[in-house]
């Protein structure tokens, strides 16, 4: 029952940690502009990694997307690449785990296979979760780079009393989105592998065998029980699971054609 | 037709208080930034007040603020200026209007005549 | 609080000429997110509440004779008549629309000659 739980646990809050994954990398909120310097902006810049927006006080929103792919930086492009390798993976981790799940039943599927594809899609979703938070963090720390870098020549003065604010970008709500659905991601799979090793068949061989000592009508039963650990010599339906796994992060964005102020 | 209408205007005494309404129709408000312009006589127009279409960003002029408060209505698509502690220098043709592309306003009303005077 | 300064405050005129008047932002008004400049250009009559004739600095209204055109880019920007006609004399107003308070330049008077 415990099992049956935790699997169900694991695979709900890796849907979860999966459908924020998707919806971070579709936000157009990974960079918003910093309004330290000017908190009475008529005009908000935020940007995405699929397309840039400003959000005007009128309530008009114009985003426009990156119609190039050499001329993005690397950075945005491994960020991109992270979060696609999450989905994709976190997809197919979802994909395994449906059939892994013990209250579903198929056919006459082994409790074995399923422990296979519980620990697969663990593992999965592990790696998914390592490529979201992977990807958010070095975006984040793309943007606290810039941010330094554009407060060092803020004021780029064109003489005289003119003032030329250069726009800086901090932390927008998809990388927090991200960082907490790669967390979930990770944690649903790390509580699929723990489900793993619960699902794996415990086997139970009582072998009775009887000796019979010659004028003696006794009957000896020896130490006949064997608990399976999964560590011993038995292998009859029986798998020793080991894995690990790692993973790495992308990102997109959405559309929003009339944001509100 | 998208048309702005005006009212509530007239003749106060300096730390009195007028209640403008401006009507919108042909357009919803709730899905546009509205503002206030003043225009004194002879004088150019000054941008009075702002509300953001969801009404979360408010921005008044420093020489306003704290005494005048600008609000929406959405279900009567109107705006208002509330004016309190009235100065002669309130003086003006007071215009609603509407936020369009790039900040602009694109449609104002006739006005309504505000007169702070003892 | 950002300045319009406008210049000339009046310009007299013949009709068919062309004119050309300033407006000058203490602040840069382009915004680096979509590399437009949020200045507005108004056009008031007397008697009348200002009408709008260009935004964006260089984009006209819909509606708005194509003898206007609007120039310029972060601190200076320019208006022009390419042939002023009588219905073109008013008081010509550019705003900043890129931070409050959304402030008005004093305006450049036109008049017949």
């Known amino acids: 029952m415990a099992v049956t739980a935790c699997q169900g646990l694991g695979f709900v809050v890796s849907l979860i940690g999966i459908a924020g994954i998707i919806a971070a990398t579709c936000m157009d909120q990974w960079s918003t502009q910093d309004l330290y310097n000017n908190p009475v902006t008529a005009v908000f810049n935020y940007q995405g990694l699929w397309r840039s927006c400003v959000r005007e006080s009128s309530g008009f929103t114009e985003c426009r997307g990156y119609f190039t792919l050499l001329g993005l930086p690397a950075m945005l492009q491994a960020v991109r690449a992270l979060m696609i390798v999450g989905i994709v993976l976190g997809a197919i981790g979802l994909l395994v785990s449906i059939f892994a799940l013990k209250c579903i039943r198929i056919g006459s599927m082994e409790d074995s296979a399923k422990a296979n594809m519980t620990l697969t899609s663990g593992i999965m979703f592990i790696v998914s979760g390592l490529c979201a938070i992977a990807g958010v963090s070095v975006f984040a720390n793309m943007l606290v780079t810039n941010f330094w870098m554009s407060t060092a020549n803020m004021y780029t003065g064109m003489g005289g009393m003119v003032q030329t604010v250069q726009t800086r970008y901090t932390f927008g709500a998809a990388l927090f989105v991200g960082w907490v659905a790669g967390g979930l991601t990770l944690i649903g799979g790390v509580m699929m592998c723990i489900a793993c090793r619960g699902l794996a068949p415990e086997e139970t061989n009582y072998k009775a065998v009887s000796y019979h000592a010659s004028g003696h009508s006794v009957a000896y039963k020896p130490g006949g029980f064997k608990a399976s650990t999964g560590f011993g010599s038995n292998t009859k339906n029986k798998k020793i699971y080991d894995g690990g796994a790692r993973t790495e992060d992308e990102v997109q964005s959405y559309p929003s054609k009339h944001d509100y102020v | 037709e998208v048309k702005l209408v005006e009212s509530g205007g007239g003749l106060v005494k300096p730390g009195g208080s007028l209640k403008l309404s401006c009507a919108a129709s042909g357009f919803t408000i709730s899905d546009y930034g509205m503002a206030w312009v003043r225009q004194a006589p002879g004088k150019g127009p000054e941008w009075v007040a702002f509300i953001s279409n969801l009404a979360y960003s408010i921005h008044y002029v420093d020489t306003v603020t704290g005494r005048f408060t600008i609000s929406r209505e959405n279900a009567k698509n109107t705006l208002y200026l509330e004016m309190r502690s009235l100065r002669s220098e309130d003086t003006a043709m007071y215009y609603c209007?509407?936020?369009?592309?790039?900040?602009?306003?694109?449609?104002w009303g006739q006005g309504t005549s505000v007169t702070v005077s003892s | 609080d950002i300045v319009m300064t406008q210049s000339p405050s009046s310009l007299t005129v013949t009709t068919g000429e062309k004119v050309t008047m300033s407006c000058k932002s203490s602040?840069?008004?382009?915004?680096?997110?979509?590399?437009?400049?949020?200045l507005t250009w108004y056009q008031q009559k007397p008697g009348q509440p200002p009408k709008l004739l260009i935004y964006w600095a260089s984009t006209r209204e819909s509606g708005v004779p194509d003898r206007f055109t609007g120039s310029g880019s972060g601190t200076d920007f320019t208006l022009t008549i390419s042939s002023v006609q009588a219905e073109d004399l008013a008081v010509y107003y550019c705003?900043?629309?890129?931070?409050?308070?959304?402030?008005f330049g004093a305006g450049t008077k036109l008049e017949l000659k």
């Open positions: 209007a509407r936020m369009y592309y790039g900040n602009a306003l694109d449609y």
């Open positions: 602040q840069n008004l382009l915004n680096s997110g979509n590399q437009k400049n949020y």
């Open positions: 705003q900043n629309d890129y931070s409050f308070p959304l402030t």
